[in-house]
């Protein structure tokens, strides 16, 4: 029988060194044997280039194209190729569809006066243009409580977050996850973090009742306590105002 | 020592043929595109073709169009000009020269980095 | 096709002072940051032509830093400073964004 595409190919660039196209075929389909994405930049001398695809489900292709670090003017003719059958033609320009890559290496430490502090790495290097686009979301949630979870819009630069332990709830295990996207791109969401877990420790202050009441401060610089004010304010933010954003 | 040597200029009359020969030395051959230039006598500079490492695109320009076809073989180190329907005002000198590096995805541009030292092709009856 | 129109067609400097050539393209010639495609070639009397500057203002291997070029878009210059004997030739800019490559019509160097 004839070889038909379904939902012709959806493209998204890391801006950097790869794009992936993803595609449907109208019956269960062997990517790798049978059909081929050609891709060439339009640009004087530009070479073709072949992409062999993967089966992401039973007749869902994928194609993971190496390109150079990306630039706005790039453009890419882009044709799906069962043997000598044409089956779709296209153009691509990885600037107007961006998904950046996905934040690295989260990490939770504990932090001075009941703080935690979330990590992680910015996955473009300091030369690339998304390096310094990029805003995430942090979702921390409760392993134990679906109802119990939060979500953090980092906007200001530097990949961390600094969460009271006193939003969390007391000797819960709680988990964090991280996603990236660049504004002015208008970017879709990178796919998240893996998860990083840790048990929220802090003791509320009532339990303190006649102990000695260490002074929450002590040692917080006032960048630091600003952090804190900031991220609450951002998760009552969120909270209010989710609708309007997601 | 990079190195381009040209060959294969002639006198030849008009609707006549030609292929101009250029073997290159020094550099990997296939990983750039080449170009040829013509210069007509006093005149200045008319890029006339152009051939991507593999060989897998090619332009022209208008005047030339139809009428020459660039060629390379890279086991060779040799890039060629079929000039067919040969005219008056093809006669120019002819240079070959070393283009972008086309293995990348986007060519790099260093522009016409390497010359050759050119052979006359005179079209007259 | 995009046309590039050089000035002036002749000049005439005395050696050590800084001599100035003008080309303008009939259309951007930036792809990205920092990529003009507009290069410079001396072709000297009896010679083959030879790269000096590409990319607007990149020297090519082996360009005295006396030769510089700048400019962005549309209008590039090339600049030889302490113009000596040898710089006597023809001046050429190219486009090499697209095809046809094209070239100006050139710019003849004398050294008084």
């Known amino acids: 029988g004839s070889v038909k595409v379904l939902h012709e190919p959806s493209c998204f660039s890391d801006y950097i060194s790869t794009s992936v196209c993803q595609w449907k075929m109208d019956h269960p389909t062997n990517c790798s044997a049978e059909l081929r994405l050609s891709y060439q930049l339009d640009f004087m001398g530009s070479e073709n280039h072949t992409c062999v695809p993967e089966n992401r489900e039973d007749s869902v292709c994928v194609c993971s194209m190496p390109i150079d670090d990306a630039v706005e003017a790039d453009v890419y003719q882009l044709d799906l190729w069962a043997g000598q059958q044409l089956l779709w033609s296209g153009s691509f320009q990885p600037s107007k569809h961006v998904k950046p890559r996905t934040p690295g290496n989260l990490t939770v430490h504990p932090n001075i006066s009941h703080t935690w502090l979330l990590m992680w790495t910015n996955p473009y290097p300091t030369e690339n243009h998304l390096h310094s686009e990029l805003t995430y979301m942090v979702n921390v949630s409760n392993d134990n409580d679906p109802e119990d979870f939060k979500v953090y819009n980092v906007t200001y630069m530097g990949p961390t977050l600094r969460l009271a332990a006193s939003t969390l709830k007391s000797g819960a295990s709680y988990s964090a996850r991280v996603r990236a996207w660049a504004q002015t791109y208008n970017s879709t969401w990178s796919d998240w973090s893996p998860s990083t877990t840790w048990l929220n420790y802090y003791e509320p202050w009532e339990q303190h009742l006649g102990k000695p009441i260490p002074n929450p401060l002590l040692g917080l610089d006032s960048t630091g306590l600003n952090d804190i004010f900031e991220a609450q304010k951002i998760e009552w933010h969120e909270h209010h105002h989710h609708h309007h954003h997601h | 020592e990079v190195q381009l040597v040209e060959s294969g200029g002639d006198l030849v009359k008009p609707g006549g043929s030609l292929r101009l020969s250029c073997v290159a030395s020094?550099?990997?051959?296939?990983?750039?595109?080449m170009t040829w230039v013509r210069q007509a006598p006093g005149k200045g500079l008319q890029w006339v073709s152009f051939?991507?490492?593999?060989?897998?695109?090619?332009y022209y320009a208008d005047a030339v169009k139809g009428r020459f076809t660039i060629s390379r073989d890279n086991a060779k180190n040799t890039l060629y000009l079929q000039m067919n329907s040969l005219r008056a005002e093809d006669t120019a000198v002819y240079y070959c020269?070393?283009?972008?590096?086309?293995?990348?995805?986007?060519?790099?541009?260093?522009?016409?980095?390497?010359w050759g030292q050119g052979t006359l092709v005179t079209v007259s009856s | 096709d995009i046309v590039m129109t050089q000035t002036p067609l002749s000049l005439s400097v005395s050696p050590g002072e800084t001599a100035s050539i003008s080309c303008r393209s009939s259309q951007s010639l930036l792809y990205s940051i920092g990529y003009n495609y507009l290069d410079w070639y001396l072709q000297k009397p009896g010679q083959s032509p030879q790269g000096l500057i590409y990319?607007?203002?990149k020297r090519a291997s082996g360009v005295p830093d006396r030769f510089s070029g700048s400019g962005s878009g549309t209008d590039f210059t090339l600049r030889i400073s302490r113009v000596e004997a040898n710089d006597t030739g023809v001046y050429y800019c190219m486009q090499g964004l697209q095809s046809p490559l094209t070239f100006g019509q050139g710019t003849k160097l004398e050294i008084k």
């Open positions: 990319l607007g203002s």
């Open positions: 051939i991507s490492g593999s060989g897998g695109k090619t």
């Open positions: 020269a070393v283009d972008r590096l086309t293995k990348t995805i986007r060519p790099q541009y260093y522009g016409l980095w390497v």
């Open positions: 020094g550099f990997t051959f296939r990983d750039y595109a």
